[in-house]
């Protein structure tokens, strides 16, 4: 049961992060031209 809840929580967090990234309209990539 605990494992299931942990899995559910992890998936929820991943979905939330994905939604926020998608709605931000930004390329959340890091700089590749210099070592920022």
């Amino acid at each position: 049961m605990k494992r299931f809840l942990f899995l559910l929580l992890t998936i929820s967090l991943l979905v939330m992060v994905q939604i926020q990234t998608g709605l931000s309209g930004q390329n959340d990539t890091s700089q590749t031209s210099s070592p920022s």
Epitope: N27, T29, Q31, S33, S34, P35, S36
Partner: antibody, heavy 114, light 111 residues
Framework: EVKLEESGGGLVQPGGSMKLSCVAS????????MNWVRQSPDKGLECIAQ??????????HYAESVKGRFTISRDDSKSSVYLQMNNLRAEDTGIYYC?????WGQGTTLTVSS | DIVLTQTPRTLSVTIGQPASISCKSS???????????LNWLLQRPGQSPKRLIY???KLDSGVPDRFAGSGSGTDFTLKISRVEAEDLGIYYC????????FGAGTKLELK
């Protein structure tokens, strides 16, 4: 879509001052070192000023040709970078790009002439 | 400062033929994190520069695979397998390992 919009260029007399501004969008601005790159027929493309991240205490670096005359700054809350230029010379004439090198805008033209 | 020397300064080509541009650095561009910050830009006539290649050989999004970057340390090359009309312009190498410096540019023009 990534956008970089430079503004503030124009005609200024030798010895005068000018401040360039740049607004960025479409990428995580506060993760990128930002630069002002000048393009002129004489010197081609040259990076004249660089500003790093908050985690680097906004460290700056300048080309010898502008050291002591130009100051770069940034405002991460506005995704903006600025270039304060004092004691301008004829050789400062050119197109000024605000760029992380990864992405480029259209630039703003500065002409220093009497 | 790191000096980048590009050759040739002008390259006259025929559409459909290959092209190659060299960029040599005065110092190694290998950074302490193991990455080499060597980029290639294209500036088409009347336009601002656009990056094509980063980290020596990685193509930016939307860049055709006829472009290829290679090299290490101080010697780098940009190759176009078959030149197309849209490839004409000035190519610049630019390093980001120690404060950005640019090559003088190579003008790719029609023969």
């Amino acid at each position: 879509e990534v956008k970089l919009e430079e503004s503030g260029g124009g005609l200024v007399q030798p010895g005068g001052s000018m401040k360039l501004s740049c607004v960025a969008s479409g990428f995580t601005f506060n993760k990128y070192w930002m630069n002002w790159v000048r393009q002129s027929p004489d010197k081609g493309l040259e990076c004249i000023a660089q500003i790093r991240l908050k985690s680097d205490n906004y460290a700056t670096h300048y080309a010898e040709s502008v050291k002591g005359r130009f100051t770069i700054s940034r405002d991460d809350s506005k995704s903006s970078v600025y270039l304060q230029m004092n004691n301008l010379r004829a050789e400062d004439t050119g197109i000024y790009y605000c760029t992380p090198i990864d992405y480029w805008g259209q630039g703003t033209t500065l002409t220093v002439s009497s | 400062d790191i000096v980048l020397t590009q050759t040739p300064r002008t390259l006259s080509v025929t559409i459909g033929q290959p092209a190659s541009i060299s960029c040599k650095s005065s110092q190694s561009l290998l950074y302490s994190n193991g990455k080499t910050y060597l980029n290639w830009l294209l500036q088409r006539p009347g336009q601002s520069p656009k990056r094509l290649i980063y980290l020596v050989s990685k193509l930016d999004s939307g860049v055709p695979d006829r472009f290829a970057g290679s090299g290490s340390g101080t010697d780098f090359t940009l190759k176009i397998s078959r030149v197309e009309a849209e490839d004409l312009g000035i190519y610049y190498c630019v390093q980001g390992t120690r404060f950005h410096t640019f090559g003088a540019g190579t003008k790719l023009e029609l023969k």
